[in-house]
Structure formats: C-alpha cells, structure tokens
C-alpha cells in the first residue's frame, strides 16, 4: 500500500535508469527514525561508523542526515511534456564524506567513505506518503528496501505477495 507494487515490473528499467544531473535538485537535513519512533544513530567506532536503531533518552539529541534529492530519468516509451518517467533518488549522508550504501551481498546497510561521483549503491529510490514518511529502495536491487531487522538497518526484500505497508521499511523524517 505504499507505492511499491509496481517495483518488480520495472526491475530492469530501474537498473538502467540514469541520474539526470550531477547536482542534487534539493537537499534536506533531517533526523531519521523508524515508523515506531526509534532513532537511527551513527557512532564512530574503531575508525569506522556503526549504524544503530535505538530509543533515545528524553533529552538526547537526534543525529541528522543530509538527504540529497536527485532526479532520475526512467527509460520508457512514455511520451509527453517531460513530466513522465522521472523518479526521485536520494543519497543519505550523516557526516561529511560518508554515505549510506547498500551491500546487496550481505543484505546490509553500511556507511562508506567515498568521493563523488557516488556509486550506484549509494542511491535509493524515494517512495513516500508525505515528505515525512518514506521508504528507500535500492537503485542496484529493485524490490529491496532499507529496513529494520534486529535493531539494525538491513536490506529487506519486499515481494508483492507480502503486506506492502510493512512498518519495518517505513521511516520518518523530521527537522527536530
């Protein structure tokens, strides 16, 4: 029920989709939390960043993530005025030079230090209710979304046979 049902149909096209500009069309600094209001936090440990899903203490400050929005042209036979076949892709950066990456082999979400241009593994197709409730689909693996598993972020396959409104792939964005 969250705009995911068409995903499998466009698997190949999604792999082939191209970012139409090297610059983001907009950027948005927000804290990221789960549908159940647990915070996504980032901690530097042994020179690498770990990602946690946890309940914050009352006055504990939420970590912020820079979401950069890119337009991606969907290769299709849709004609018209240029408004069709476009998707929004996002990259998520909690700190300078580090971006969330999809590790499809390990079904994990990791923070990698890298330079631009970013690899495809750092791009996620944005699905949303409103701008404050979203899902992130892997550009490199259509039908696979960032989700919560055992208090960690993981990659979760969403099949059309499942409940498509699965709460563990829904995230809230907030300014606070």
């Amino acid at each position: 029920a969250f705009g995911i049902s068409g995903v499998q149909k466009y698997t190949r096209a999604l792999h082939d989709s191209s970012i139409t500009g090297i610059s983001p069309i907009t950027e948005y600094l927000a804290s990221l939390s789960t549908y159940n209001d647990q915070s996504i936090t980032f901690a530097l440990e042994d020179e690498s960043y770990e990602i946690y899903v946890e309940d914050l203490k009352k006055d504990e400050k939420k970590d912020k993530v820079l979401l950069s929005y890119y337009e991606s042209q969907h290769p299709s036979n849709e004609s018209g005025d240029g408004v069709d076949g476009k998707m929004l892709m996002v990259t998520l950066s909690p700190t300078k030079d580090f971006w969330l990456h999809a590790n499809n082999k390990e079904h994990s979400v990791e923070l990698h230090k890298c330079e631009k241009p970013l690899p495809d593994q750092a791009f996620f197709v944005l699905h949303n209710m409103h701008s404050n409730c979203v899902s992130f689909e892997c550009k490199t693996d259509p039908g696979v979304f960032i989700g919560v598993k055992d208090n960690h972020l993981a990659l979760i396959k969403v099949d059309s046979s499942e409940n498509l409104c699965t709460e563990n792939i829904l995230f809230k964005l907030s300014e606070t």
């Epitope: 049902s5 408004v83 409103h130």
Partner: antibody, heavy 121, light 106 residues
Framework: EVQLVETGGGLVQPGRSLKLSCVAS????????MYWIRQAPGMGLEWVSS????????YYLDSVKGRFTISRNNAENTVYLQMNSLRSEDTATYYC??????????????WGQGTLVTVSS | DIQMTQSPSVLSASVGDRVTLSCKAS??????LDWYQQKVGEAPKLLIY???NLQTGIPSRFSGSGSGTDYTLTISSLQPEDVATYFC????????FGQGTKVEIK
C-alpha cells in the same frame, strides 16, 4: 501525450451524491499518485484528496472527510471521487492531477481541464 | 496545518519589468514548494518545483528561490503571455496552496 479527462460533473441538489471520474492516458498510471483539486468560482485552488499509486493510502481535506471517497482502478487507468452529502460550498471546478514523480507525493506534474460541480436547490 | 500566504494579491507591471511574487509559510517547509500558473479559463500548470527547479518547457525568465518559511517567484522580464494568477503550494506536511497572486499588465 499525457491526458487527464474528468467527467461526472453537473448540477446537483444539496445532500445528494455525485461521482467524478478521471481517465488517464499517455503515462504509466499505476506508478503515480493521483489527486483531486478544486476551485470555487472566482476563487483560489484547494487540494481535496490524494491517493497513492496502488490505492492503499488516501488523504482528504478536513471539510470533505467522511463525505468524499477517492479510489482508483489501475487496470482501467481511472481515478474516482465519490462525493456524498454535497453542500453548496462544494460548488467548484474539480481538477484531476497526476504526481510529478514515480511513487512520490511531491508536486502536481499535469492537470486535467476540470469538471464543474454545482450544488444548488 | 501549514498556512501559505501570498503577497501581493494583485500585481500590475509593465512589459519588460522584473516582477517578484512572495509566498510565506506558517512553518518551515524545507524547500518543498511549487509554483503554478493559471491563465483565465485554463487548468493550472506546474512552473517550478522544489523551490527553484524549472519545469520542462517553461521559459527561463521564470525562477524561484527561498528556504525555511520565505519563498519567491521572479519573472525577470514580464511578457504579455505571463498575465495569469500564480499559486504557491507546499507539500512538506500535507498539501496546501497559497491564495494566489494575480499578475496584470499596466
């Protein structure tokens, strides 16, 4: 070419019902959020209702909640607005619009020409 | 709910003038703002999305700017075909239009 064609408008008495339809063509309908927006004569635009691409999530303007129902049939490329218990203040041109991006509720990328609904006794 | 307030309600300017329309949100809308143009007897048309991105086919004399709660639509050189009502629209939280600014030629 993208096309949205609204039908179903007309003159209706207060308290009665009307069902608007919007037939879409020229784009992959099932990938887009769809919307109804209205404009009372000589007035501004007012968002009325939204439905996500597979129809599982719907949203309404407070003043129409419980009276209006948005739905869609992706096999027939059609979005509907069922309007019950109509009031004189519902008199407006009703526009159907499509989202700007796949899977996203951001922006109205394209609008139909509208259908006029007049609620009067 | 987020309220959107546009000013002025009516703007009269000469052909070739630089014209600025304002839109103010009651809360921070994080650049989640569009501008729509509606000519008399026509359906509205998307001009600018995400504050400053020009929709395909829209002349480059139109531009948008702003952040937080304050946003602006600028027409660098007003043309006769720009006579219309312009609406701002936020989608950061729900969906809300401003009341519109009518642009006329002096």
């Amino acid at each position: 070419e993208v096309q949205l064609v609204e039908t179903g408008g007309g003159l209706v008495q207060p308290g009665r019902s009307l069902k608007l339809s919007c037939v879409a063509s020229g784009f992959t309908f099932s990938n887009y959020w769809m919307y109804w927006i209205r404009q009372a004569p000589g007035m501004g635009l007012e968002w009325v209702s939204s439905i996500n691409n597979d129809g599982g999530n719907t949203y309404y303007l407070d003043s129409v909640k419980g009276r209006f129902t948005i739905s869609r049939n992706n096999a027939e490329n059609t979005v509907y607005l069922q309007m019950n218990s109509l009031r004189s203040e519902d008199t407006a041109t009703y526009y159907c619009a499509k989202g700007h991006y796949y899977y996203s509720s951001y922006s109205f990328g394209y609008w139909g020409q509208g259908t006029l609904v007049t609620v009067s006794s | 709910d987020i309220q959107m307030t546009q000013s002025p309600s009516v703007l009269s300017a000469s052909v070739g003038d630089r014209v600025t329309l304002s839109c103010k949100a009651s809360h921070n809308i994080n650049k989640h703002l569009d501008w729509y143009q509606q000519k008399v007897g026509e359906a509205p048309k998307l001009l600018i999305y995400f504050t400053n991105n020009l929709q395909t086919g829209i002349p480059s004399r139109f531009s948008g700017s702003g952040s937080g709660t304050d946003y602006t639509l600028t027409i660098s050189s007003l043309q006769p075909e720009d006579v219309a009502t312009y609406f701002c629209f936020q989608y950061n939280s729900g969906w809300t239009f401003g009341q519109g600014t009518k642009v006329e030629i002096k």
